[in-house]
């Protein structure tokens, strides 16, 4: 995380600073939710443990064609050291359980506020 | 299979109203942003807009005024509507439809071709 | 709006050489360190086929002749070698600020 160009600035970006952004992001998405959130559709849940911002990606980037969280999918991409494409599944999914989107956003919202109040940054 | 089917007037005359309609199958509306690119004859590509699965529509902000994008998710189906034709409106009229994330461009009609003349 | 600028407007190429096509943006289309700039193949009386996404990933089926790269603002596709069935217009597209924009596209001519 630490080399992330491309966030706000052309320069590298402190882990701090790009975790508070997608933070504010999540936010952002679960406070101007107004139909169900793209078009309520279920992704697989996660281990919010080591590896989350790629099992993050691999569930989210299986949602098209919703604008709510093309930052998001943005975000993530850039977090994620790995090419992840739709379709594809690693053992970072609960397999057996599929929630919605806007569930997952929030989740994923609680755990990111956790780390970044623990100073959990990478 | 994927399919997206362009379906439009062929000739309007200048200063009338375009209305096309893309047919999609294999995917649904709902989960899928399409959009709409023109090419007049013997020149390059230029995107119209797009309206996402979740109902945002974007548009090329030098045509704004002049466009209108909807559709009709059950029935399959995307609009375009652009006012106030002029000759250099003349050209062919795609619909595509966004993929995964990154949306790139996956699929494509075939086009329909757009005549603007008296 | 980002203005994409294609280089050269047309080329023509042995069979069996190496193809080079530039594309500039007149701003950056990175955004989270990707790339939000593709590259699609155009040939006559066909709609265009998507080619290469994130301006350096090939889509399925793409054969690997077909290459991608750059960031920022300079991308560039190469075709090599070059084949007969590769005679097409090649566009540039971004999808990173504001309104998507096409590049003005290069017609390859094979030689």
């Known amino acids: 995380l630490t080399c992330l160009g491309g966030f706000a600035s052309p320069g590298p970006v402190p882990p701090s600073t790009a975790l508070r952004e997608l933070i504010e992001e999540l936010v952002n998405i679960t406070q101007n939710q107004k139909a169900p959130l793209c078009n309520g559709s279920m992704v697989w849940s996660i281990n919010l443990t080591a590896g989350m911002y790629c099992a993050a990606l691999e569930s989210l980037i299986n949602v098209s064609g919703c604008s709510a969280i093309e930052k998001t999918q943005r975000m993530l991409s850039g977090f994620c050291p790995h090419k992840v494409s739709a379709g594809q599944f690693s053992s970072l999914h609960v397999r057996d359980t599929k929630i919605e989107v806007a569930q997952f956003v929030k989740d994923l919202l609680l755990h990111l506020k956790k780390l970044f109040r623990e100073g959990q940054f990478n | 299979q994927v399919q997206l089917k362009e379906s439009g007037p062929g000739l309007v005359a200048p200063s009338q109203s375009l209305s096309i309609t893309c047919t999609v199958s294999g995917f649904s509306l709902t989960g899928y942003g399409v959009n709409w690119v023109r090419q007049p004859p013997g020149k390059g590509l230029e995107w119209l807009g797009m309206?996402?699965?979740?109902?945002?529509?974007d548009y090329n902000s030098a045509l704004k005024s002049r466009l209108s994008i909807t559709k009709d998710n059950s029935k399959s189906q995307v609009f375009l509507k652009m006012n106030s034709l002029q000759t250099d409106d003349t050209g062919r009229y795609f619909c595509?439809?966004?993929?995964?994330?990154?949306?790139?461009?996956?699929?494509w009609g075939q086009g329909t071709s757009v005549t603007v003349s008296s | 709006n980002i203005v994409l600028t294609q280089s050269p407007a047309s080329l023509a190429v042995s069979l069996g050489q190496r193809a080079t096509i530039s594309c500039r943006a007149s701003?950056?289309?990175?955004?989270?360190?990707?790339?939000?700039l593709h590259w699609y193949q155009q040939k006559p009386g066909q709609p265009p086929k998507l080619l290469i996404y994130l301006a350096s990933n090939l889509e399925s089926g793409v054969p690997a002749r077909f290459s991608g790269s750059g960031s920022r603002t300079d991308f560039t596709l190469i075709i090599d070698p070059v084949e007969a069935d590769d005679a097409a217009t090649y566009y540039c597209q971004q999808n990173n600020e504001g309104p998507r924009t096409f590049g003005g596209g290069t017609k390859l001519e094979i030689k």
């Open positions: 309206i996402w699965g979740d109902e945002r529509i």
């Open positions: 595509a439809r966004d993929g995964y994330f990154p949306y790139a461009m996956d699929y």
């Open positions: 701003e950056t289309v990175d955004s989270y360190g990707k790339s939000y």
